[in-house]
Amino acid sequence: EPPTACREKQYLINSQCCSLCQPGQKLVSDCTEFTETECLPCGESEFLDTWNRETHCHQHKYCDPNLGLRVQQKGTSETDTICTCEEGWHCTSEACESCVLHRSCSPGFGVKQIATGVSDTICEPCPVGFFSNVSSAFEKCHPWTSCETKDLVVQQAGTNKTDVVCGPQDRLR
């Protein structure tokens, strides 16, 4: 009886089970009752990453420097090229097809997590007792200066954007 289902790494064609081509190879011709599936290695700059019956290999992704991209990992016959972004930029999507400049955290906000090639800067509001007076992609919220430890007193209260201003204690005459 002709098979209706085939084993893993096989496919059904013309009432018979043929072997799939291994990763890195494409299908040239289906198997017959006399010959096995004929496969050929993918060419330079091509790949196939699964057991397959594809007649064409896929082109490696191009990391376009005009879009801020660079090669993170060179592709092989079995894997695609992995792109990442130039320093100071990050991918706009998981596929990393283009890059955007890392965002800066405005005054009043500090960097919670520094950006990577694939994720943007994560900012957080400076809580009470902390401030940030710059727009930065690296600076965290800084704690207010402790006037007491300097034997000074607070002359001007701090905000989320400014540090406290310390001054000398009033002396009793």
Epitope: V28, S29, C31, T32, E33, F34, T35, E36, E38
Partner: antibody, heavy 117, light 107 residues
Framework: EVQLVESGGGVVQPGRSLRLSCAAS????????MSWVRQAPGKGLEWVAS????????YYPDNVKGRCTISRDNSKNTLYLQMNSLRAEDTAVYYC??????????WGQGTLVTVSS | EIVLTQSPATLSLSPGERATLSCRAS??????LHWYQQKPGQSPRLLIN???QSISGIPARFSGSGSGTDFTLTISSLEPEDFAVYFC?????????FGQGTKVEIK
Amino acid sequence: EVQLVESGGGVVQPGRSLRLSCAASGFTFSNYGMSWVRQAPGKGLEWVASISSGGDDTYYPDNVKGRCTISRDNSKNTLYLQMNSLRAEDTAVYYCTRAGGKAMDYWGQGTLVTVSS
Amino acid sequence: EIVLTQSPATLSLSPGERATLSCRASQSIRDNLHWYQQKPGQSPRLLINYASQSISGIPARFSGSGSGTDFTLTISSLEPEDFAVYFCQQFNSWPLTFGQGTKVEIK
């Protein structure tokens, strides 16, 4: 028991034709691809033709394409090889073989074809 | 066309000795190779398929190995009935091709 019995061989003049037959028994003939393989005296094996189980697909090497035709009659459990424009280099023992697991798992006893003037 | 080259052409050994026959393909054929034995005046018979798979009814002293372009048929201990000609055959692609054969003869 699987049996393949070839017939139709003999002495034939160059340029003439010959039809070989192979009577199959002991298995379901219509489920198997079949092939012809030849062997010139004192030489190695050479594939001549193959035909799929249903008879729809045929395969030939370039050196016999156009001169040889493989066919089958599943109702008669018989395989054929029609050879035309025979040449001295076609002189050989012709074997009928069954394709099992993509191998030639059973062979007939062979029939000798001699092309000579 | 895939060319199969068998070596040596002739192997002279004594019964009980180990025989190692080689078959080399002109390009990679994965494990798509069979081995056949032919005794004088007889038809060939299948010994090994898919380079290393044993065939029912064939003595265990016959074994095959290899993949890609280099294949080996080993007869672990020669019996008198093993002196014959051995052919490899590829079924990776059309046309089907055979090696020219290795004759194992009594020394």
